[in-house]
């Protein structure tokens, strides 16, 4: 029969045949051949991975380190990383959670609206139409565009949510 | 390698007065927001006060409002707070910051002490 040139869900190919994939939880030892199935072994401890898979090694938990104010929310298993998180009263710097602080800030573009308390962090809002924040800022609100007219002047370049309109002189009506 | 050094506490009666000063090293002080926050005995962290980086601005938590006042020179790259009226529970270990504030490097603190 011709060689296959894909294979089925859950199958990779190697040496024009079709193997299995090993299961989440395992990786591989050896391909399958003509007459053996692929060979996997489970991880071992402190190691996952987490799809079906025709990795040689597997990886290693995430390290919840304490001294990052860092501790475990959920233990990983053979199939699924660890979860950290940061110390109560501590917030975590990103989704990944790989470093914490007393409090978020928000970024260019967002302001401000609550202010961290001990007990929630910050809260952030998008800078809306007429306003900005250029900044990246746990206090500041967005500040609205400043206002041209109010000192005789126009609009040369237009505000953005991170950048504040830039006023320059009317134009004289030449003779 | 930024270096925050505060300064300034001691023991002083209820309804007294301190100042605590931050020198800062190691990174563009003028662009940071930078902050106060304490830790009375066996409690958390506790923000009591920030500012912008040029100053223009001054953000301060409910239990120091009206008391206390955070300001900057940064020509000398340092921060300072301004503590008034001072009350036995604001007895703690002071330590400077700059946002955000991060776990893994808080300086050195300064302990004041409010008792009679």
């Known amino acids: 029969p011709e060689p296959p040139t894909a294979c089925r869900e859950k199958q990779y190919l190697i040496n024009s045949q079709c193997c299995s994939l090993c299961q989440p939880g395992q990786k591989l030892v050896s391909d399958c051949t003509e007459f053996t199935e692929t060979e996997c072994l489970p991880c071992g401890e402190s190691e996952f991975l987490d799809t079906w898979n025709r990795e040689t090694h597997c990886h290693q938990h995430k390290y919840c380190d304490p001294n990052l104010g860092l501790r475990v929310q959920q233990k990983g298993t053979s199939e699924t990383d660890t979860i950290c998180t940061c110390e109560e009263g501590w917030h975590c710097t990103s989704e990944a959670c790989e470093s914490c602080v007393l409090h978020r800030s928000c970024s260019p573009g967002f302001g401000v609206k609550q202010i961290a308390t001990g007990v929630s962090d910050t809260i952030c809002e998008p800078c809306p139409v007429g306003f900005f924040s250029n900044v990246s800022s746990a206090f500041e609100k967005c500040h609205p565009w400043t206002s041209c007219e109010t000192k005789d002047l126009v609009v040369q370049q237009a505000g953005t949510n991170k950048t504040d309109v830039v006023c320059g002189p009317q134009d004289r009506l030449r003779a | 390698e930024v270096q925050l050094l505060a300064s300034g506490g001691g023991l002083v009666q209820p309804g007294g007065s301190l100042r605590l000063s931050c020198a800062a090293s190691?990174?563009?002080?003028?662009?940071?927001?930078m902050i106060w926050v304490r830790q009375a005995p066996g409690k958390g962290l506790e923000w009591i006060s920030a500012?912008?980086?040029?100053?223009?601005?001054?953000y301060y938590a409910d239990s120091v409002k009206g008391r206390f006042t955070i300001s900057r020179d940064n020509s000398k790259n340092t921060l300072y707070l301004q503590m008034n009226s001072l009350r036995a529970e604001d007895t703690a270990v002071y330590y400077c910051g700059k946002e955000p504030f991060r776990f893994d490097y808080w300086g050195q603190g300064t302990l004041v002490t409010v008792s009679s």
């Open positions: 500012i912008s980086g040029s100053g223009g601005s001054t």
């Open positions: 190691g990174f563009t002080f003028e662009e940071e927001e």
